[in-house]
Interface confidence: low
């Protein structure tokens, strides 16, 4: 058993048929000593007397508010959570695996620039009695320290017979240096809670490796004179790293036809500027990545043709 | 060329020899994302790779102040990883295969790092730890750990040649 | 060769003040961040607080915040904490060092400085 805050407590136990579980004791958080009772959540019935009361925990009825009383009053409260493992592996039953990039990602990451700033989300069934608290260092054997906000619902999706709720927290590193190669990855760890179920979660990376920009801006078409072709050009994400001589990005640039069959055009250019040929019912979109390091492709930036 | 006493490096060389690096590191070892190789005990193997770290001036207000702290911290990595490339780790079976980026990513880092520092001069280079893995399936390992980990430093080193390319060249 | 000396360290009432300072040399102190850690009597050693390469911005933890500031002189490679209304649990030997990503994953610490608060 373990604090996870104060008056909440999390039993770890093995979950399998007719397991022993864990025996528990605990104290009422008062000088009082005699005539003292202990209830749990909404029941009357009393489980025990006196300043202390041992119980064995082994299933969900087990776990939930302990309250000891004494004459009517209120004397103070432990939560009791469970945190299960299932043949030597602790359960994910909260959030949902999002199998991208591979399977068991539970945690996704993206990072705009390189200032120390990044969001991660999740998703899960889960509508009701849910809560998550989200704990970040960079390196864990001598943490430095990244401060997260509170994890907000920000999207609610149907898929199905079910809707799927997703979660985010964004994070910042206390002390971020843009230029540095890591050496030290970031960690996440996201503390979920469903009604009396206990379950962690952990995501380790690099900066580098979670970098995504945003799509870059004011994408404009300038028809060359006689000719099919257009100059298209384009400006630097405004959330990305500056200096750009020093933080470049890499663009891609392609000319697709309405019909998603057809032949895709693709340029490649370190410019904020090149010259392809505009066919009709056309879209021209461009992308961007970092120009030193293959971290992911931003969204597409498009424009008609016409 | 950044030679000890402080002179300017040939930024421009320097920057287009860095990207072609990057080019290379990222042929060799594509796999971004889909082999988490941290989580194969990295401890003992990335410890000693020389980092470039805050603190050794590769930002742009440090390559502005004075660009020597970052060249010589960068010149101590492509020896270092020069080395490792040149290394039984990536001479050892099992073989690369001929036309495998390695052999040509092994010259461009000889030749950036001769760029940074001509004949004669020396800075002092960071010891290559002795990493001699027994089996192939190791070595396989600690090459793919390399190439993440000289992805990270040559893109760094991209970033300062470029800037200083573009906002340094007398 | 990278060094961190701390100083200005002693005994001081409940409710005193005291300035530490850390010098550096052997790296470009100018761009890097630094911190204050402590480390109390039997405990691990813990962030106090951290100023970025320009001293504009600066991050302290709850436990100090309001009583402890932190400031740097880059043309003097010192970076200062200066500590108010000391509590006795502020007892701990104060060390600096940069917050970033250390020096490798084997970080270098200076010898530290014992400040010591009690009546």
């Known amino acids: 058993i373990w604090e996870l805050k104060k008056d909440v407590y999390v039993v770890e136990l093995d979950w399998y048929p007719d397991a022993p579980g864990e025996m528990v004791v605990l104290t009422c958080d008062t000088p009082e000593e005699d005539g003292i009772t202990w209830t749990l959540d909404q029941s009357s019935e009393v489980l025990g007397s006196g300043k202390t009361l041992t119980i064995q925990v082994k299933e969900f009825g087990d776990a939930g508010q302990y309250t000891c009383h004494k004459g009517g009053e209120v004397l103070s409260h432990s939560l009791l959570l469970l945190h299960k493992k299932e043949d030597g592996i602790w359960s994910t039953d909260i959030l949902k695996d999002q199998k991208e990039p591979k399977n068991k990602t539970f945690l996704r990451c993206e990072a705009k620039n390189y200032s120390g700033r990044f969001t991660c989300w999740w998703l899960t069934t889960i509508s009701t009695d849910l809560t998550f608290s989200v704990k970040s260092s960079r390196g864990s054997s001598d943490p430095q320290g990244v401060t997260c906000g509170a994890a907000t619902l920000s999207a609610e999706r149907v898929r199905g017979d079910n809707k799927e709720y997703e979660y985010s927290v964004e994070c910042q590193e206390d002390s971020a240096c843009p230029a540095a190669e890591e050496s030290l990855p970031i960690e996440v760890m996201v503390d979920a809670v469903h009604k009396l179920k206990y379950e962690n979660y952990t995501s380790s990376f690099f900066i580098r490796d979670i970098i995504k920009p945003d799509p870059p801006k004011n994408l404009q078409l300038k028809p060359l004179k006689n000719s099919r072709q257009v100059e298209v050009s384009w400006e630097y994400p405004d959330t990305w790293s500056t200096p750009h001589s020093y933080f470049s990005l890499t663009f891609c640039v392609q000319v697709q036809g309405k019909s998603k069959r057809e032949k895709k055009d693709r340029v490649f250019t370190d410019k904020t500027s090149a010259t392809v040929i505009c066919r009709k019912n056309a879209s021209i979109s461009v992308r961007a990545q970092d120009r030193y390091y293959s971290s992911s492709w931003s969204e597409w930036a498009s424009v008609p043709c016409s | 060329r950044a030679v000890p006493g402080g002179s300017s490096p040939a930024w421009t060389q320097c920057q287009q020899l860095s990207q072609k690096l990057c080019t290379l590191a990222w042929s060799a070892h594509p796999l971004v994302g889909h082999m988490d190789l941290r989580e194969e005990g990295d401890e003992e193997t990335t410890n000693d790779v020389p980092h470039i770290q805050c603190g050794d001036g590769c930002d742009p207000q440090g390559l502005r102040d004075n660009s020597q702290f970052c060249l010589q911290r960068i010149h101590q990595g492509l020896i270092f990883y020069e080395k490792l490339l040149g290394s039984d780790i990536f001479t050892g079976e099992p073989s690369l295969l001929p036309d495998s980026p390695v052999g040509q990513l092994h010259a461009s880092l000889l030749g950036l790092s001769q760029l940074l520092q001509p004949e004669g001069h020396h800075w002092e280079t960071q010891q290559i730890p002795s990493l001699s893995p027994s089996q192939p399936w190791q070595r396989l390992l600690l090459r793919f750990k390399i190439l993440r980990s000289l992805q990270a430093f040559v893109a760094v080193a991209a970033r300062v040649f470029a800037h200083g390319a573009a906002t340094l060249s007398p | 060769q990278l060094q961190l000396v701390e100083s200005g360290g002693g005994l001081v009432q409940p409710g005193g003040s005291l300035r530490l300072s850390c010098v550096a040399s052997?790296?470009?102190?100018?761009?890097?961040?630094m911190a204050w850690y402590r480390q109390r009597p039997g405990k691990e050693r813990e962030l106090v607080g951290s100023?970025?390469?320009?001293?504009?911005?600066?991050h302290y933890v709850d436990a100090v915040k309001g009583r402890f500031t932190i400031s740097r002189d880059n043309a003097k490679n010192t970076v200062y904490l200066q500590m108010n209304v000391l509590k006795p649990e502020d007892t701990a030997v104060y060390y600096c060092?940069?917050?970033?990503?250390?020096?490798?994953?084997?970080?270098?610490w200076g010898q530290g400085t014992q400040v010591t608060v009690s009546s």
């Open positions: 060092n940069s917050p970033n990503t250390g020096w490798g994953t084997r970080r270098y």
């Open positions: 052997g790296f470009a102190f100018s761009t890097y961040a």
């Open positions: 100023i970025d390469s320009s001293g504009d911005n600066t």
